[in-house]
Interface confidence: low
């Protein structure tokens, strides 16, 4: 399987909410001994390997934000801890999983990584990640709503997030 990031860049005004999204692609085993661990964390640019550094999102580690379930199952973080920090990660039946960040501030700007690990008998068989950038803007140049930019370089048209 692979992880796709539909959008590589999210540009949002301060105070807005944003949902960063990744999508699980390809065949997914549904055996009883196979589960998927999905999570989110921040990283930094200029690394040899993107997403190798794991930083917290609003002081919450990837541990705090993880989802752990079988194949294309729906799940979401029930942690009060995450919600107190204005965060919620979720996963649907179609392989999409996301993190929603509420009331954005300039400090939220940076590189975000989604991580998916396929686990068989508690052993990590396959680990993939996706990366995207969030830019939070303030002032007269800031957009009125979040604007997202598709990952494909052929897509030149901006898509406004709902």
């Amino acid at each position: 399987f692979k992880v796709a990031t539909p959008y590589s860049l999210y540009v949002c005004p301060e105070g807005q909410n944003v949902t960063l999204t990744c999508r699980l692609l390809g065949p997914v085993d549904k055996g009883h001994d196979v589960t998927f661990y999905k999570t989110w964390y921040r990283s930094s640019r200029g690394e040899v390997q993107t997403c190798s550094e794991r930083r917290p999102i609003r002081n919450l580690t990837f541990q705090d934000l993880h989802l752990h379930h079988g194949g294309h199952q729906a799940a979401n973080t029930s942690h009060d801890l995450a919600q107190r920090h204005g965060l919620e990660s979720a996963s649907d039946h179609h392989g999409n999983f996301s993190i929603t960040m509420r009331n954005l501030t300039l400090l939220d700007s940076g590189l975000y990584c989604c991580l998916v690990v396929e686990i068989r008998h508690h052993h990590s068989e396959h680990r993939v990640h996706g990366a995207m950038e969030l830019q939070v803007q303030t002032g007269k140049d800031a957009p009125s709503n979040c604007v997202v930019y598709p990952s494909s370089s052929q897509d030149s048209e901006n898509i406004t997030a709902a």
Epitope: Y37, S52, Q63, H66, L81, V117, H122, H123, R127
Partner: antibody, heavy 121, light 106 residues
Framework: EVQLVESGGGLVKPGGSLRLSCAAS????????MNWVRQAPGKGLEWVSS????????YYADSVKGRFTISRDNAKNSLYLQMNSLRAEDTAVYYC??????????????WGQGTTVTVSS | DIQMTQSPSSLSASVGDRVTITCQAS??????LNWYQQKPGKAPKLLIY???NLETGVPSRFSGSGSGTDFTFTISSLQPEDIATYYC????????FGGGTKVEIK
């Protein structure tokens, strides 16, 4: 402050039992897999057992399989190691350690100070 | 079980020296290898994970490299506070530690 504190060690005769406890604080205990690692006097580190965050997955080293039982109580932020049929070679400092779960962990990043178990007649 | 062979078992070096420790796995473990530092009477401390990634807060004089079966841990410039025993540890899938390398100052 992220902290692990072990207790329950002591002197026990061969064939006896002990229950070690590890109290966790300063982090969301229920999100992490946990381990017991031991170190015999003057020797190296030996992994003993691990338990996943929700107790779904439990593993033991061959040297303790069938004699030791790992468990946890997430409501109490506590990890346990029940040690039965103790042998002289189980004499060691026992550490509990937090496993950074990826979910395949990339290391044990927080350790307790250790509790000493001595098995001797 | 995967065996980890660490060498040397002990070494003595001067302050400022470059120190290298090797660890060999009995079979391919990809990059599933960590390095720990243990000072006398203290609990181990994670220094490097996934063979080459420095744990947060660890000085940059520590580094790791390797993949497969052969791994290297390096202290680029030995400091007095680096006196300790260093352990490699694999996790593919269950943990085993190397025998340790005791580092002393000449």
């Amino acid at each position: 402050e992220v902290q692990l504190v072990e207790s329950g060690g002591g002197l026990v005769k061969p064939g006896g039992s002990l229950r070690l406890s590890c109290a966790a604080s300063g982090f969301t205990f229920s999100s992490y897999s946990m381990n017991w690692v031991r170190q015999a006097p003057g020797k190296g580190l030996e992994w003993v057992s691990s338990i996943s965050s929700s107790s779904s997955y439990i593993y033991y080293a061959d040297s303790v399989k069938g004699r030791f039982t790992i468990s946890r109580d997430n409501a109490k932020n506590s990890l346990y190691l029940q040690m039965n049929s103790l042998r002289a070679e189980d004499t060691a400092v026992y550490y509990c350690a937090r496993e950074v779960y990826d979910p395949h962990y990339y290391g044990m990043d927080v350790w307790g100070q250790g509790t000493t178990v001595t098995v001797s007649s | 079980d995967i065996q980890m062979t660490q060498s040397p078992s002990s070494l003595s070096a001067s302050v400022g020296d470059r120190v290298t420790i090797t660890c060999q796995a009995s079979q391919d473990i990809s990059n599933y290898l960590n390095w720990y530092q243990q000072k006398p009477g203290k609990a181990p401390k994670l220094l490097i994970y996934d063979a080459s990634n420095l744990e947060t807060g660890v000085p940059s004089r520590f580094s790791g490299s390797g993949s497969g079966t052969d791994f290297t841990f390096t202290i680029s410039s030995l400091q007095p506070e680096d006196i300790a025993t260093y352990y490699c540890q694999q996790y593919n899938p269950l943990p085993t530690f190397g025998g340790g390398t005791k580092v002393e100052i000449k």
